[in-house]
Interface confidence: low
């Protein structure tokens, strides 16, 4: 009976330990479930954050591209130079400069070239109207970029293109032959042929910078 | 002894159960520790992601502001109008238009006003040099915005400011009195006083649009 009592006491102890252990397991199970839930929440949070980060990265990339484009556009436009340099007249697609010095045709041509321009070329009646108006208050002759070697040659512009016959009639020394060639000048709205060696004012012309207008 | 055997058997069972439970607890403890570690890692990941997201948001905000600024600048510059309208000459801070019609001083003044401009005002010797050069190939007179009621009055520009005496000497009919007043014109580089009722060419002037240059 002493053995029996001892065994009963041990049994009670073991039962108590077992119950305690079972309680611990139950608590741990609950904690584990809670931990699992928390972990799932954390994983979900991570997923959300990762998605948000990915979205932000996409948006940022887009903004960055926009920025680059804007900077590029700005680079093109910001120093958006005027259509024409100072002292030139801007008309339609061209810039015109009325020289303030008097030189022979070749020297006048050189002067224009040094300004990245050519002597006046008249392409249309509208061009002619503008030039006639622009020099209406001058009685002086102005060289234009039109010349020919001698009367048997055609009238050619500096770029080698021929004069359109309907534009204007050339008056003056049309049948004369000069060693330096025959050049055309415009005076009071009419165009005249003259010895290229004579000094006259001139009109330079170049394309207007209309990119950003 | 039968009771003792039974108790021994129960004890063995309980010990076995206890050992099993202890094993379970140990396993759960390890799992919990692993879970805790994993959770810590997840939390760390969340922290990292949150920080990254915050940084991205800051960057994005910055890019957004940059974008807005660029768009604003572009708005100001993109339609960057030319310093001067077509057919005008841009020189320094001003635009100049040499009229192609001949009118009296008052009518010339009206024509300039209709173009949002005024008759020529010469503020400096540099202005005078430019104008002298610009009209060097004309023998015609050009009205400027300078006039006086009669010889006992001072010469005044259109804006009411007086003529600086060092700029130029006025020649011609300076001591004449005209019913319409005495007006100044520039011709071949010199300035003359004349009856305002005479018809002449004129020079209009307005501020150049240099915002984006």
């Amino acid at each position: 009976s002493q053995v029996s009592n001892l065994l009963k006491q041990q049994q009670t102890n073991l039962t108590h330990q077992k119950n305690k252990l079972e309680g611990q397991i139950s608590a741990r199970q609950q904690a584990e479930e809670a931990s699992q839930e928390s972990q799932n929440e954390l994983k979900e949070m991570i997923e959300t954050l990762a998605w948000k980060l990915n979205e932000k990265s996409k948006e940022q990339m887009e903004l960055h591209h926009q920025n680059l484009n804007l900077q590029e556009t700005l680079k093109r436009v910001a120093n958006c130079s005027a259509p024409c340099p100072q002292d030139w007249i801007w008309h339609e697609e061209n810039c015109y400069l009325f020289s303030t010095g008097s030189f022979n045709w070749e020297k006048s041509q050189e002067k224009c070239l040094s300004l990245d321009a050519k002597l006046l070329k008249i392409n249309s009646t509208a061009d002619l109207d503008f030039i006639q108006q622009a020099i209406s208050y001058s009685s002086f002759p102005f060289w234009m970029g039109l010349s020919r070697r001698n009367p048997s040659y055609p009238w050619l512009w500096e770029d080698g293109s021929p004069l359109m016959p309907h534009l204007f009639r050339i008056r003056g020394a049309v049948s004369q032959t000069y060693p330096s060639g025959t050049c055309a000048y415009i005076q009071r709205g009419a165009v005249y042929a003259e010895n290229c060696i004579l000094a006259a004012f001139s009109i330079c012309q170049k394309k207007a910078n209309l990119r950003a207008q | 002894s039968q009771v003792s055997n039974l108790l021994k058997q129960q004890q063995t069972n309980l010990t076995h159960q206890k050992n099993k439970l202890e094993g379970q607890i140990s396993a759960r403890q390890q799992a919990e520790e692993a879970s805790q570690e994993s959770q810590n890692e997840l939390k760390e990941m969340i922290e990292t992601l949150a920080w990254k997201l915050n940084e991205k948001s800051k960057e994005q905000m910055e890019l957004h502001h940059q974008n807005l600024n660029l768009q604003e600048t572009l708005k100001r510059v993109a339609n960057c109008s030319a310093p001067c309208p077509q057919d005008w000459i841009w020189h320094e801070e001003n635009c100049y238009l040499f009229s192609t019609g001949s009118f009296n001083w008052e009518k010339s003044q009206e024509k300039c006003l209709s173009l949002d401009a005024k008759l020529l005002k010469i503020n400096s010797t540099a202005d005078l040099d430019f104008i002298q050069q610009a009209i060097s190939y004309s023998s015609f007179p050009f009205w400027m915005g300078l006039s006086r009621r009669n010889p006992s009055y001072p010469w005044l520009w259109e804006d009411g400011s007086p003529l600086m005496p060092h700029l130029f000497r006025i020649r011609g009919a300076v001591s004449q009195t005209y019913p319409s007043g005495t007006c100044a014109y520039i011709q071949r580089g010199a300035v003359y006083a004349e009856n305002c009722i005479l018809a002449a060419f004129s020079i209009c002037q307005k501020k150049a649009n240099l915002r984006a240059q």
Epitope: G101, A199, A200 | S139, L198
Partner: antibody, heavy 115, light 107 residues
Framework: QVQLVQSGAEVKKPGASVKVSCKAS????????VHWVRQAPGQGLEWMGA????????AYVQKFQGRVTMTRDTSTSTAYMELSSLRSDDTAVYYC????????WGQGTLVTVSS | DIQMTQSPSSVSASVGDRVTITCRAS??????LVWYQQKPGKAPKLLIY???SLQSGVPSRFSGSGSGADYTLTISSLQPEDFATYYC?????????FGQGTKLEIK
């Protein structure tokens, strides 16, 4: 005071050229155009053209275009008028004058064209 | 070219007389007109510019008027030194053309 002094009288054969000079003093030569006017014996005044001494630019009457050349030498304040392929009806007094209206005139140079 | 026509081509008058010479342009010249006086063997002398402005040093008996295409030179009281030929000239546009002249002779 302002003065324009012209070169002396010339006698030329038809087909020849004549160059008349006009020396200016008493004002800034480059500031004022120099005009050339001629007057045939017993006739009226005829404007031939002008030169802008500052730039050297010249304007000629169409009638004389190709025969007349107006030049200047700013170092001596002198304007020149050269008329080529002379004919008998070019016989005239040739005047230089300053500016428009022509406020100062040279004394005139008689050019006689005769074979 | 603008044609300038003076009338009369000659006029006889006495000292103290009032004399009027007219000049007509073939088109309006906006008062850009001058009058010159020329004596035999001499260069012309500027009297009036801009139709009515008296050149400095010219006696006030000389006056100019007119507008559009019609202009007048008036000598209010003829003096012996005024007998000469008078020319008008337009200077609106090149070629700057002269009138044919009006010879003022002693009656």
């Amino acid at each position: 005071q302002v003065q324009l002094v012209q070169s002396g009288a010339e006698v030329k054969k038809p087909g020849a050229s004549v160059k008349v000079s006009c020396k200016a003093s008493g004002y800034t030569f480059t500031d004022y155009e120099v005009h050339w006017v001629r007057q045939a014996p017993g006739q009226g005044l005829e404007w031939m053209g002008a030169i802008h001494p500052g730039s050297g630019g010249a304007a000629y009457v169409q009638k004389f275009q190709g025969r007349v050349t107006m030049t200047r030498d700013t170092s001596t304040s002198t304007a020149y008028m050269e008329l080529s392929s002379l004919r008998s009806d070019d016989t005239a007094v040739y005047y230089c004058a300053r500016w428009l209206p022509m406020d100062y005139w040279g004394q005139g140079t008689l050019v006689t064209v005769s074979s | 070219d603008i044609q300038m026509t003076q009338s009369p081509s000659s006029v006889s008058a006495s000292v103290g007389d009032r004399v009027t010479i007219t000049c007509r342009a073939s088109q309006g010249i906006n008062n850009w007109l001058v009058w010159y006086q020329q004596k035999p063997g001499k260069a012309p002398k500027l009297l009036i510019y801009a139709a009515s402005s008296l050149q400095s040093g010219v006696p006030s008996r000389f006056s100019g008027s007119g507008s559009g295409a019609d202009y007048t030179l008036t000598i209010s009281s003829l003096q012996p030194e005024d007998f000469a030929t008078y020319y008008c000239q337009q200077y609106l546009i090149t070629p700057y053309t002269f009138g044919q002249g009006t010879k003022l002779e002693i009656k």
